[in-house]
């Protein structure tokens, strides 16, 4: 099943339009903004989700721009160009012909240039560090319980195999989740760590992308884990190329 047949909805992506016009009258869902058919048994790519987010009417948008803590993805929202598979195109340009190169999670990895800018390949983000601060609790969470629950969350909610959750670090109140997935490790059908991280980021902000599933309710031994702030760091297989000017 690519979508829930009975009421023809997409469990993994609420930003879709679904209708029973697939083969044999099956429910088929298309992403808002792009019209690309999505597989509702898995996560939708971040590129298509960003495109859908940007296509939503301004007054109807209940979603917010990344806040001032988005240290890495500090260009905020943009309307991306996606390839036919829903991946980010290596080169992104805005309406004023300003262009830049992005990695596989759509984060800028070069200085901005003009239409002559070349981006030879889409560079894969193979290591993502999700840095969370949780709200104060009476006592610290047990590290092994926390590790087990976060791996279970990524497996069951985002369908990311536990082998891609490289480590869970904890020093109260900071939790760090390391996701690692090299090109050679990612098999057909595997969820991309960038997509899982994006769904998780939206979940902790209370902006779940799932349809019908409840919001994120993360508990460790029955104790609610409430996230106060999130930082996400992206490491690419090839280091980014920024001029020295940007670093000063």
């Amino acid at each position: 099943h690519t979508a829930a047949q009975d009421n023809c909805t997409c469990p993994t992506n609420k930003m879709t339009v679904c209708s029973p016009d697939g083969p044999g009258g099956r429910c088929q869902c298309r992403a808002l903004g792009s019209g690309v058919a999505v597989d509702c048994s898995t996560l939708t790519s971040k590129c298509l989700l960003l495109k859908a987010r940007m296509s939503a009417p301004k007054n109807a948008r209940t979603l917010v721009r990344p806040n001032e803590h988005a240290l890495v993805d500090n260009d905020g929202l943009y309307d991306p160009d996606c390839d036919p598979e829903g991946r980010f195109k290596a080169r992104q340009c805005n309406q004023t012909s300003v262009c830049w190169c992005v990695n596989s999670v759509g984060v800028r990895r070069t200085d901005k240039g003009d239409l002559s800018l070349r981006c030879d390949e889409l560079v894969r983000t193979h290591h993502i560090l999700i840095d969370l601060r949780h709200r104060p609790t009476a006592s610290a969470f047990n590290h092994s319980d926390l590790d087990a629950e976060l791996r279970r969350l990524f497996r069951e909610r985002y369908r990311l195999h536990p082998k891609f959750v490289a480590a869970v670090h904890y020093e109260q109140p900071t939790i760090q989740i390391e996701l690692r997935q090299n090109t050679s490790q990612k098999a057909a059908g595997d969820v991309d760590i960038g997509d899982a991280a994006y769904y998780f980021e939206r979940d902790v902000k209370g902006e779940s992308l799932f349809q019908g599933r409840g919001g994120l309710d993360l508990r460790v031994r029955g104790e609610p884990l409430q996230v106060e702030r999130t930082l996400i760091y992206y490491l690419d297989e090839i280091p980014p190329k920024f001029s020295m000017k940007r670093l000063t």
């Epitope: 829930a4 791996r151 279970r152 069951e156 195999h161 969820v191």
Partner: antibody, heavy 120, light 110 residues
Framework: QEQLKESGGGLVQPGGSLTLSCKAS????????VSWVRQAPGKGLEWIAY????????YYATWVNGRFTISSHNAQNTLYLQLNTLTAADTATYFC?????????????WGPGTLVTVSS | DVVMTQTPASVEAAVGGTVTINCQAS??????LAWYQQKPGQPPKLLIY???KLASGVSSRFSGGGYGTEFTLTISGVECADAATYYC????????????FGGGSEVVVK
């Protein structure tokens, strides 16, 4: 050939303890999750616990309440289930079962089981 | 807690006939459902996963369907060797779970 083989079952007195073992062969233990499932005589299947050996992540059925402990010795490709404070209701065949290696929890490889009898 | 309910508890089937077993989840498990066959004195054997996908080496006479909360296992062209107990299992989560398995359905072949 991929195989699981349980051992350690037998007769135990009420209130006693027992440790069951499950030896895996023919595959890398670390690439899968493994569960213990039990079946009382003439009854249905009852899930007990699950472990992801690589990270020693453990998960238990809500009814276990700390009486049972799942663990693994990865170098020996062996899974364990420690049973404590046993009662007659724990009399069952205990199976270990390996998941299929994906992200859902279906079990495509099972051991033949080991019988635990709790009786005085 | 997701609770799985199977019906009927027992069903008779004629050789060559068709049998359908039902499984209901107390809340949506999308397509994360597995079916097992168990014969006396043997461990269970995985037949179907993700509600409708046939496990390796399983006869195409077995088929699964359903989504969300309602699922079925159908055995067509029933053979004597199909006499067994069949179990459904939610394969979505192991968090806050009492038992992911249904109570079982015995198939008696006449």
């Amino acid at each position: 050939q991929e195989q699981l083989k349980e051992s350690g079952g037998g007769l135990v007195q009420p209130g006693g303890s027992l440790t069951l073992s499950c030896k895996a062969s023919g595959f890398d233990f670390n690439n899968y999750g493994v569960s213990w499932v039990r079946q009382a005589p003439g009854k249905g299947l009852e899930w007990i616990a699950y472990i992801y050996p690589t990270y020693h992540n453990t998960y238990y059925a809500t009814w276990v309440n700390g009486r049972f402990t799942i663990s693994s010795h990865n170098a020996q490709n062996t899974l364990y289930l420690q049973l404590n404070t046993l009662t007659a209701a724990d009399t069952a065949t205990y199976f270990c079962a390996r998941d299929a290696g994906g992200t859902d929890y279906n079990f495509n490889l099972w051991g033949p089981g080991t019988l635990v009898t709790v009786s005085s | 807690d997701v609770v799985m309910t199977q019906t009927p508890a027992s069903v008779e089937a004629a050789v060559g006939g068709t049998v359908t077993i039902n499984c209901q989840a107390s809340q949506s498990i999308e397509s994360y459902l597995a079916w097992y066959q168990q014969k006396p004195g043997q461990p269970p054997k995985l037949l179907i996963y993700e509600a409708s996908k046939l496990a390796s080496g399983v006869s195409s006479r077995f088929s699964g369907g359903g989504y969300g909360t309602e699922f079925t296992l159908t055995i067509s062209g029933v053979e004597c060797a199909d006499a067994a107990t069949y179990y459904c299992q939610q394969a979505l989560t192991i968090g806050n779970v009492d038992n992911p398995f249904g109570g079982g359905s015995e198939v008696v072949v006449k």
